[in-house]
């Protein structure tokens, strides 16, 4: 044996964002022919013997960071990369505005601003089929996300979420979705390969993306840090990316 | 009540060969992982081996590895450890310990140890 | 030599508040593992003492306490006793090749 055995996948189906009471799975995935693995839930102490985590109803207490390795031979695999299991609808939505307004002219300027009741000091911002995040100020109570000589490809549908720092597994509701629109051009924004939001398709999680393979990034301006959230990395080269632009204290 | 009880300390010269046993009792042993942990005398304590609870998963201290074989009955409620090449440093007393499980998960700790059994190795 | 990182001894006066360190790395405590602490009294097998970096089992009094923080974590002990006299063990998980590891141990005399 030259080197240590490479880490395996750790994915969660159908999105790392799991509304409470909803279902997941976890999936750890290691070459062919390993049986052996331990998938762990980091800061518990505690671990289990399979691969597979099938939650039937997301909770408070299974929210965290998640770990999995597999044993062959006596030799353990080097661990997966961390997936961060986040419970959403824990907290009440908070509510989403574009200003001046959700219609902007191409060229213009535009600022997104995710706003709450609570005194949360994080917010994550997410764009269907977004490549990229933006950097944002910080706010307390409220976080702007400003959209600097927006472009047709800044068209689309957005939510937010709010969390607290303290609990960062534990997010509200998404808010509800604002559709943004470029106008003054002709060129057409990328889409999701799916029909058109729709209030009742909880931000695609249950609906059109469950066999969408996607690549969640969590940014947070505080560490600059980049975390892959959800890593489903390339069995979809069609599938959309979801960004979430978290904005710390 | 949860109860481990070793056994098959002694007196061993080096070189030989030593199988220890911890027997439990009160509660469902097929459900979890079980483990040795040792004392050299004076000194502090010094995790050995575990095995998982279906006898699957098995781990080693990089300090016995190769020597030292973990295994367990679980029609019988018994873990063992049979102890091969046995040396001076090896000299402890053994406890078997339990670790906590709730549900599906298991944990990286201890919650019931056994009172430990004497091994020596001299000659 | 012990992977977490203890002190040999501690000691206080009965009533007296003590603590005890507990310095892992970052395969270990800081790889995300708890902190368990075990109490070894004289001549007996350890008992679980605190779990989960801060939990007590049943029947542990509410003058032991622990933390944990980035590599290290501590136990710290209220209103000491004479019957707290025994030796404390600190135990986490580490990364490398899955193994449990153990402090080196902290004896605590009262004064």
């Known amino acids: 044996q030259s080197g240590p055995l490479p880490k395996p996948s750790l994915q969660a189906l159908p999105s790392s964002l799991v509304p409470l009471e909803k279902p997941v799975t976890l999936r750890c995935q290691g070459p062919p022919g390993v049986d052996l693995y331990r998938l762990e839930k980091l800061s518990s102490s505690r671990y289990q013997d399979q691969a597979v985590l099938f939650i039937p109803a997301m909770k408070r207490s299974l929210a965290g960071r998640y770990r999995c390795s597999y044993q062959n031979g006596s030799l353990w695999s080097l661990p997966s990369d961390q997936l961060e299991l986040v419970a959403t609808g824990v907290f009440a939505k908070p509510s989403l505005s574009a200003q001046p307004g959700p219609a902007v002219s191409s060229g213009g300027d535009v600022t997104l601003q995710c706003q709450t009741r609570y005194g949360f000091d994080q917010f994550a911002l997410y764009k269907e089929g977004d490549p990229a995040p933006y950097k944002n100020p910080e706010r307390w109570y409220r976080a702007s996300f400003p959209i600097i000589t927006v472009t047709a490809a800044h068209s689309g549908t957005y939510r937010c979420y709010s969390f607290s720092s303290r609990d960062p597994y534990l997010w509200s509701a998404p808010s509800d979705p604002l559709e943004l629109v470029v106008t003054g051009t002709s060129v057409t924004p990328s889409r999701l390969p799916t029909e058109p939001p729709s209030p009742v398709a909880e931000f695609s999680e249950a609906t059109a993306e469950l066999t969408v393979s996607f690549t969640n990034e969590v940014f947070t301006t505080e560490t600059s840090r980049s975390i892959t959230a959800s890593p489903k990395e390339s069995d979809s080269p069609a599938g959309p990316a979801r960004q979430y632009y978290t904005k710390g204290n | 009540q949860v109860q481990l009880v070793e056994s098959g300390g002694g007196l061993v010269k080096p070189g030989g060969s030593l199988r220890l046993s911890c027997a439990a009792s009160?509660?469902?042993?097929?459900?979890?992982?079980m483990s040795w942990i040792r004392q050299a005398p004076g000194k502090g304590l010094e995790w050995v081996s575990s095995v998982g609870s279906e006898g699957k998963f098995i781990d080693y201290a990089a300090s016995v590895k190769g020597r030292f074989t973990i295994s367990r009955d679980n029609a019988k409620n018994s873990l063992y450890l049979q102890m091969n090449s046995l040396r001076a440093e090896d000299t402890a007393v053994y406890y078997c310990a339990r670790h906590y499980r709730e549900f599906r998960w298991h944990y990286y700790y201890f919650d019931y140890w056994g009172q430990g059994t004497l091994v020596t190795v001299s000659s | 030599q012990s992977v977490l990182t203890q002190p040999p001894s501690v000691s206080g006066a009965p009533g007296q508040r003590v603590t005890i360190s507990c310095t892992g790395s970052s395969s270990n405590i800081g790889a995300g593992y708890d902190v368990h602490w075990y109490q070894q009294l004289p001549g007996t097998a350890p008992k679980l003492l605190i779990y989960?970096?801060?939990n007590r089992p049943s029947g542990v009094p509410d003058r032991f306490s622990g933390s944990k923080s980035g590599t290290s974590a501590s136990l710290a002990i209220t209103g000491l006793q004479a019957e707290d006299e025994a030796d404390y063990y600190c135990?986490?998980?580490?990364?490398?090749?899955?193994?449990?590891?153990f402090g080196g141990g902290t004896k605590l005399t009262v004064l």
């Open positions: 009160g509660f469902s042993f097929s459900d979890h992982y």
């Open positions: 989960g970096n801060s």
């Open positions: 135990q986490s998980h580490d990364l490398g090749a899955h193994v449990w590891v």
